[in-house]
């Protein structure tokens, strides 16, 4: 059980207050993290509170401002990027969000040597992506779906691609589905380590069906947003990878990298690109039926001016029990010999672990093992490998950082973080400087987050970078709910749950229960992290018990749990939420007449299905931006878990797993359905179809749409949303306003 913060003296209680909804909506209790912007082994940049860009040298202890807030303000810059030769800084302004990661911006180049903005050959606007080469100060950028290269910031640009067209051909940036479901980045170009080559992806969306929705705006006529968006079973983007020599790009031009024959034989995806050296690159490909992934190592042949990907350097990763990888196929981390690498994939017992691949995957050497999972490889140096896992004390929702000494035999393992601030910190990430000389640890909880700087050799803490003192002080007179993370054992399935309990929780009393669910494949909700959010308020002020349950399909507990939902979405995720609720009722402090469930996105799908399960457990529930049929969602995501919606594949379950098929079952629950009309991700279509089915079944329900809002329902919509949902729940639970 974690109590945050501990309450020792009862005399303090009368000076303390509960959280308010206003606190949550104002972000009163938000925390800060500190991620150094590393620029060498011992130096990093950080934007100070007053917006100066400051360079810190850990070894000398000195710091100085490289770019003043005055310069930043002169172009309204909200972001910056220092060139590796430290001669120039790009300043980013006019940020305009597109999708989850993508945005356009205006860029200005500032010359640090003369203290002036570079004039002549200025960058066009708006730019879709811009980055420095890893060495020197070459610039690559994407403008109007084409890639351009500048040898120096003041030089004229060289146009690398010419076929870029809005919504048709994307060069150096992903289309919608690759951005959201495959790359999880706004870019699709990669510099080689010393900047000799530039690799990029070209996505051809010419044949992809288009999702069209109205954006109402303020004009007399709404405009129509068109996005090439492949839904399950539809035509997918066609991807090609090219590499161009950036020294003399006009000579040979872009060279296409060949696709492995076993991948090219049917529909496929490109999943990631990793440079190994300036003349060796590693590409990962995935069959459309996402249980086969191929890692292909390609070498530059100077005499042929081409990229050669020999079959002997193809490594196949295949899943026989589910899909390849976790959420994504993991990426390799190459060792210093520039051919062998470390990679996370399932071991023979079905747990994701680090393996060392020297020649073939079959001969891989397993580096970590156990009934827990390795989650991320942060850095490999000559003698150490740093990774995170949830091994410590067998809590899947924790993250600790480990170091394995790979320079010695047998390799020894050390937990770097397990005992640092044990009560406060059980969920870490890390950020390493060059050669791992130093690293920052960012602890997310369960206590108040703290960021610290450490020596990469000794692991000694050097200084606290951010400890959220103001937050700590602000929380001193707040009655925070109690949180506990425990597990249920049901039919050989372990269901971890987090329970958020009212501050004066009394086991002998009865409380309304709200289940918050996400439940998507390879997700995890039960995590040892700090949060003061809406559900904290509901427990603190409104006296609700809130529970989050990680059921089948969730991550980091082995393939048996993860792949249980393969080809059967919408079944076990719902069953496990229901099972958990029954167990919570058995605990004796839940008012079984006042149980609700809510979720967003995949969670909206699960909450809808749970409400329509016919169990009679739930009095009411909320679905925010739910998926309602897997035929309406993106191909890359959906088919990974469901296969294709064709008769000879999995059409039957696509049809059986819709929310609409259960319309009749909503008759005995109070249902609040919420969706943004400009949701590019889970289209409004999903909720429109639920609403239509409920109307056709003559089932009463409540609904709220948010005009021109996307999947995030941000800005003023957030306030309206949480206020509206609060009223709905309080009414459902008969709580007075």
């Amino acid at each position: 059980i974690v109590l945050r913060p501990s309450r020792v003296h009862n005399s303090e209680e009368n000076t303390m207050r509960a959280l308010t909804l206003k606190d949550i909506l104002n972000g009163t209790f938000s925390y800060k993290t500190f991620f150094p912007n590393w620029i060498s082994g011992q130096e990093y940049l950080h934007q100070s509170a007053d917006n100066n860009i400051v360079l810190y040298n850990i070894e000398t202890g000195q710091s100085y401002t490289i770019l003043s807030n005055r310069t930043m303000k002169s172009v309204n810059a909200s972001n910056y990027g220092l060139s590796p030769d430290r001669q120039f800084v790009y300043l980013e302004s006019d940020y305009s969000k597109l999708w989850r990661y993508s945005y356009t911006a205006t860029y200005y180049i500032y010359d640090l040597s003369n203290g002036e903005f570079v004039r002549g050959n200025e960058l066009p606007r708006p730019i879709q992506y811009l980055c420095w080469s890893p060495v020197g100060s070459k610039l690559a950028y994407v403008y109007q779906n084409n890639i351009y290269l500048k040898q120096r910031p003041g030089d004229p640009p060289f146009q690398i691609t010419f076929n870029g067209r809005e919504n048709k051909i994307f060069n150096g940036i992903p289309d919608w589905v690759y951005e959201e479901e495959m790359l999880a980045t706004k870019y699709a170009l990669w510099w080689s380590p010393n900047g000799k080559f530039l690799a990029y992806a070209e996505f051809n969306d010419t044949d992809i069906p288009v999702i069209a929705y109205s954006y109402y705006g303020d004009e007399q006529y709404p405009r129509t947003i068109n996005i090439p968006y492949p839904k399950a079973g539809a035509k997918n983007p066609v991807v090609r990878i090219f590499i161009i020599d950036t020294t003399y790009p006009a000579y040979v031009g872009p060279q296409e990298v060949p696709v492995p024959a076993m991948i090219a034989s049917s529909d496929y995806y490109f999943s990631w690109l990793t440079w190994v050296t300036d003349e060796r690159v590693c590409l990962q490909w995935l069959k459309r039926v996402q249980n086969v992934s191929v890692l292909s190592i390609c070498d530059f042949r100077e005499d042929w001016q081409t990229w050669d990907c020999p079959k002997t350097q193809e490594h196949i990763e295949e899943s026989r029990t589910g899909w390849a990888g976790g959420f994504f196929v993991s990426t390799p981390v190459f060792s210093y010999d520039a051919i062998s690498y470390y990679k996370i994939f399932s071991d023979k017992d079905g747990y994701k672990h680090i393996h060392y691949i020297k020649d073939t995957v079959e001969n891989a050497i397993q580096i970590t093992s156990g009934k827990w999972e390795a989650i991320n490889i942060f850095r490999v140096t000559q003698d150490s490998l740093f990774y995170s896992s949830n091994e410590f004390e067998e809590y899947p929702g924790r993250r600790n950082i480990y170091r394995i000494s790979i320079g010695s035999y047998p390799p020894s393992k050390k937990c770097v973080t397990c005992h640092l601030r044990k009560e406060r910190c059980q969920y870490y990430t890390a950020s390493f400087s060059d050669y791992a000389k130093y690293y920052a640890l960012v602890c997310y909880g369960p206590g108040i987050p703290i960021s610290t700087l450490h020596d990469g050799r000794t692991d000694q803490e050097i200084k606290i970078l951010e400890e959220n003192k103001e937050l700590e002080n602000a929380l001193k007179n707040i009655q925070l709910p109690k949180e506990e993370i425990k597990k249920l054992e049901v039919d050989e399935i372990t269901l971890w749950y987090k329970m958020i309990l009212p501050p004066q929780f009394d086991r002998s009393k009865k409380y309304p229960l709200l289940i918050q669910v996400y439940g998507g494949p390879c997700s995890q909700s039960v995590r040892s992290v700090f949060a003061v959010n809406w559900i904290s308020y509901l427990a603190s002020k409104e006296g609700m018990v809130i529970a989050l349950v990680d059921g089948r399909g969730t991550a980091f507990q082995g393939d048996k749990l993860l792949y249980a939902v393969y080809r059967k979405l919408g079944v076990y995720e719902v069953e496990d939420q229901i099972t958990a609720v029954r167990k919570f009722i058995e605990m004796g402090f839940i008012d079984e007449k006042r149980i609700a469930i809510w979720g967003w996105s995949y969670g909206g799908y699960v909450s809808s299905l749970a409400l329509a399960s016919g169990t009679g457990l739930f009095k009411c529930g909320i679905a925010v931006a739910p998926v309602s049929s897997w035929e309406y969602y993106a191909s890359v995501y959906t088919e990974r878990f469901m296969g294709l919606p064709t008769k000879d594949d999995n059409l039957e379950h696509y049809k059986n797993s819709t929310v609409m098929a259960r319309a009749e079952y909503f008759r005995n629950v109070d249902y609040l359905l919420i969706h943004g009309t400009a949701d590019d991700n889970v289209h409004f279509q999903n909720s429109a179809q639920i609403a239509k089915a409920l109307v056709n079944a003559q089932v009463d329900f409540q609904a709220m749409w948010y005009s021109d809002q996307n999947h995030g329902l941000s800005g003023l919509s957030t306030n309206h949303l949480y206020t509206h949902m609060t009223h709905f729940l309080k009414q459902c639970f008969s709580l007075s306003d």
């Epitope: 020294t247 003399y248 006009a250 000579y251 031009g253 296409e256 042929w304 001016q305």
Partner: antibody
Amino acid sequence: EVQLLESGGGLVQPGGSLRLSCAASGFTFSSYAMSWVRQAPGKGLEWVSAISGSGGSTYYADSVKGRFTISRDNSKNTLYLQMNSLRAEDTAVYYCAKGWLGPFDYWGQGTLVTVSS
Amino acid sequence: EIVLTQSPGTLSLSPGERATLSCRASQSVSSSYLAWYQQKPGQAPRLLIYGASSRATGIPDRFSGSGSGTDFTLTISRLEPEDFAVYYCQQGLNIPSTFGQGTKVEIK
């Protein structure tokens, strides 16, 4: 050693068509972008067209756009220039050259195209 | 398009003399994209210099290139009899790739 050998030139009437070929050897043809550059009698050099190594991307000077088509057959190590709607001002020696937009490190000996009635 | 203007149009020099040929671009051209060629009567052009200053394979070191931005120079330190020809500069920064009108180096 790298060799480029053009053929297909000759006398053609205005409005007529001609197809030039360039046989390549001595290098991995499919790896390189290739170009056509022409030189009118007694005049300077003019870049006409280029094609990527795979043949997937083509580029043209405005003066020939819509009339000329560049293509290649990598299985035959051959570059082509299909010239339609020929005009008197297209009269020139046509060179095939190895490279995209430059530098052009190897050139053929050229083939003369004369457009005249 | 980028217009390259070469000067002088003709350069009359004796063997052993130094030749300096100029190429001016109508807009800035990064040095990576500037090349020089030599052409003799009845022959195809031959690459001399690429990247404004790098000599192509087999080109004698009496040929050198320099310059950046809009002004580029080809220098032949000591003219040999076989160097009398027409010289072209060329840019590959923009499509269309363009050539200068040429400088003829003739025997005085």
